[in-house]
């Protein structure tokens, strides 16, 4: 267990031209506040995916009124740190989103209004217990300067806050194999005792007495390889006879989600869908109102009409969920017709149409043959969103403009020689073969495998292919 701490140093116009307008004015005074969202790993997760490591909201900053004509200065900031407690191990690598919000304090009906000024995101490596790391991030014309660190809560220590420290039993030294707990030299590292029998290779523990499995292993002691090929259930200890998985304890068993949250399993853990008014990894954060800025992704917060609708987020296009935390996969509805490629640009959908189709949803089938002539007597044939020409004999190519070489495909069998002819091709057959393509052998007794040769042609004469 531990705490991620974020200190905002400044928020103001970035360097370079195009300084942003002040977000506040004499007519509309405002104040800033910040929201941080943390996720484990270096994932390229979208802004709306759950803040699995936790989230925090700052206090409101001092009220600020723009001085007319003055450029936007660094804006006054809220006091104090943003603190995100984490219950489990610190992952070492994490992704963050820091949002700067403006609270307008004008005389609006319905109370103050919130709007998102800037959002910065990044992926970092950070060991718990280390010094403050400084960072500068830009969002449009704005610049945010901040520092962050992760620190363990006693008795946890170490870069992941998984080692435990205990006061020394002997004044001079620690027990066998146990080191002093830097920086608490008067304490000793406590052995982390996992559940008895927990596999040292495939299991680990973050709390004494537990046994958590690495991916690919299961069972109470993490000794059973996961093999679901012939099984129905996706988890649990192996059946001794089949090697199949049978249902065992899953991450949602016992429902870790508090306050009526519903649990769904994810490949590595679980995810809580929280009722309105609660959020956090386990729906443990409660008493949320619009003052807490619960609507993500620029959602507009309004107070609800009863205790179960304490606040309501009106989501911008492309987002949904009670906190606007889910991106709508609008392409999953397959809005592009006729094989068009769907692109969700966030603010809008675009369809990239296949040849021969047009329109916002590729719904218009272009008249493929309109204005397209096929040369040399060819006829245009529509089909599949593309035109093609059915060419007259002796011509080929997309528009029948190329004179076809009928001999290019070597149509004469058994060594026959091909001659181009104005109406097609002629095969001169090798001795012992006959037919339009020299495909029939002449029988040894002089009789043909065909009916008698047409009058005027002896076997072996060139046969013209019509």
């Amino acid at each position: 267990a531990g705490v991620f701490e974020l200190q905002i140093h400044s928020f103001g116009p970035g360097p370079g031209p195009g300084a942003p307008r002040s977000p506040c004015s004499a007519r509309l005074p405002c104040r800033l506040f910040f929201r941080v969202c943390l996720k484990p790993g270096l994932s390229e997760e979208a802004a709306e995916s759950p803040c699995a490591l936790g989230a925090a909201l700052s206090a409101r900053g001092p009220v600020y009124t723009e001085q007319p004509g003055a450029p936007a200065p660094d804006l006054p900031l809220p006091d104090g740190l943003l603190q995100v407690p984490f219950r489990d191990a610190w992952p070492g690598t994490f992704s963050f989103i820091i949002e700067t919000w403006r609270e307008e304090l004008g005389d609006q009906i319905g109370g103050p209004a919130w709007s998102l000024l800037a959002r910065v995101a990044g992926r970092r490596r950070l060991a718990a217990g280390g010094p403050w790391a400084r960072d500068i991030q830009r969002a449009g014309a704005w610049e945010l300067r901040f520092s962050y660190r992760a620190r363990c809560e006693p008795p946890a220590v170490g870069t992941a806050c998984t080692r435990l420290c205990r006061p020394r039993s002997a004044p001079s030294r620690c027990g066998p194999g146990l080191r002093p707990c830097a920086p608490l030299e008067d304490e000793c590292e406590a052995p982390l005792v996992c559940r008895a029998g927990c596999s040292p290779e495939h299991g680990f523990c973050e709390q004494p007495g537990e046994c958590r499995c690495l991916e690919g292993w299961t069972g109470p002691l993490c000794t059973v390889p996961v093999s679901t090929s012939s099984c129905l259930s996706p988890r649990g200890p192996s059946s001794a006879t089949t090697g199949c998985l049978v249902p065992g304890p899953g991450p949602c068993d016992g429902n870790p989600c508090a306050n009526g949250g519903s649990c769904s399993e994810t490949p590595r853990s679980f995810e809580c869908t929280c009722p309105r008014g609660f959020y956090g990894l386990r729906c443990e954060v409660s008493g949320v109102t619009c003052a807490d800025g619960p609507c993500f992704n620029g959602g507009l917060c309004v107070g609800g009409a009863d205790p179960d609708s304490a606040y309501i987020c009106h989501c911008p296009p492309g987002f949904q969920g009670s906190n606007c935390e889910k991106r709508v996969d609008r392409c999953s509805l397959q809005p592009c017709r006729n094989g068009g490629l769907c692109l969700d640009l966030g603010h809008a959908l675009r369809c990239r149409c296949r040849a021969g189709f047009a329109g916002p949803r590729c719904e218009h089938d272009l008249d493929d043959c309109a204005g397209r002539a096929c040369a040399n007597g060819g006829t245009c044939v529509e089909g599949g969103g593309a035109h093609r020409c059915s060419c007259a004999l002796g011509f080929g190519g997309r528009d029948c403009r190329e004179r076809a070489d009928p001999c290019a495909a070597r149509p004469c069998a058994h060594g026959g020689r091909c001659y181009a002819h104005f109406s097609g091709l002629v095969c001169a057959c090798a001795p012992g073969y006959m037919g339009a393509r020299c495909e029939f052998p002449v029988h040894p007794d002089g009789a043909s495998a065909l009916p008698a040769a047409p009058p005027g042609l002896r076997p072996g004469d060139p046969q013209r292919y019509l």
Epitope: G260, P275, R276, V302, G304, A305, P307, A310, I312
Partner: antibody, heavy 117, light 109 residues
């Protein structure tokens, strides 16, 4: 547009029973708490009962005047709200409304319950 | 059990501004009471006007606004119209129990 349609009202004798239904459409019924409100002839509004959603374990709440006589329930799969009324009294005569609160109040058109000897 | 009190009747003229209030016997009304305002017109025609103290329902004219004034919830009609003549109920939530006021009969002469 959100629609709440109440049915099941009628004339019943004192100590009798009646079950009201409310069919809900055009919103995600499962997400929200639902309520019954009534208005006796010539009187004001009185809240009767409330049922929360599945996330809140379908917790129920009642006005003191109907406690132990009325039971509110819901069927999320059918988007239906119910009010089972037992041991009815003459003072239960009223127009009964299915009501849900979100950003503001949504009302049905009501169903009339008359308790008379 | 909380008691919610409203003015029994108010009279205003077209174009005037009128404020209806809603008092709680348990103390000051706060946003945690999620004050709601409902309009009743003849033939049991109920319309939700305001929810959650401030939120005006879609289709409700902008002349209707909800707020907290002192220790009471308030419904203000800025520039009353003759069609605003109706009975107005306020409802306050106390945890999971809802209590309505007795209603204010508004006359627009």
């Amino acid at each position: 547009e959100v629609q709440l349609v109440e049915t099941g009202g009628g004339l019943v004798q004192p100590k009798g029973s009646l079950k009201l239904s409310c069919a809900v459409s055009a919103f995600t019924f499962t997400t929200y708490a639902m309520n019954w409100v009534r208005q006796a002839p010539g009187k004001g509004l009185e809240w009767v009962a409330r049922i929360r959603n599945k996330s809140n374990n379908y917790a129920t709440y009642y006005a003191d005047s109907v406690k132990d006589r009325f039971t509110i329930s819901r069927d999320d799969s059918q988007s239906m709200l119910y009010l089972q009324m037992n041991n009815l009294k003459i003072e239960d005569t009223a127009m009964y409304y299915c009501v849900f609160y979100y950003d503001y109040v949504y009302w049905g058109q009501g169903t009339l319950v008359t308790v008379s000897a | 059990q909380a008691v919610v009190t409203q003015e029994s009747a108010l009279t205003t003229s077209p174009g005037e501004t009128v404020t209806l209030t809603c008092r709680s016997s348990t103390g000051a009304v706060t946003t945690s009471n999620y004050a709601n305002w409902i309009q009743e017109k003849p033939d049991h025609l109920f319309t939700g006007l305001i929810g959650g103290t401030h939120n005006r329902a879609p289709g409700v004219p902008a002349r209707f606004s909800g707020s907290l004034i002192g220790d009471k919830a308030a419904l203000t009609i800025t520039g009353a119209q003759t069609e605003d003549e109706a009975i107005y109920f306020c409802g306050l939530w106390y945890s999971n129990h809802l209590v309505f006021g007795g209603g204010t009969k508004l006359t627009v002469l």
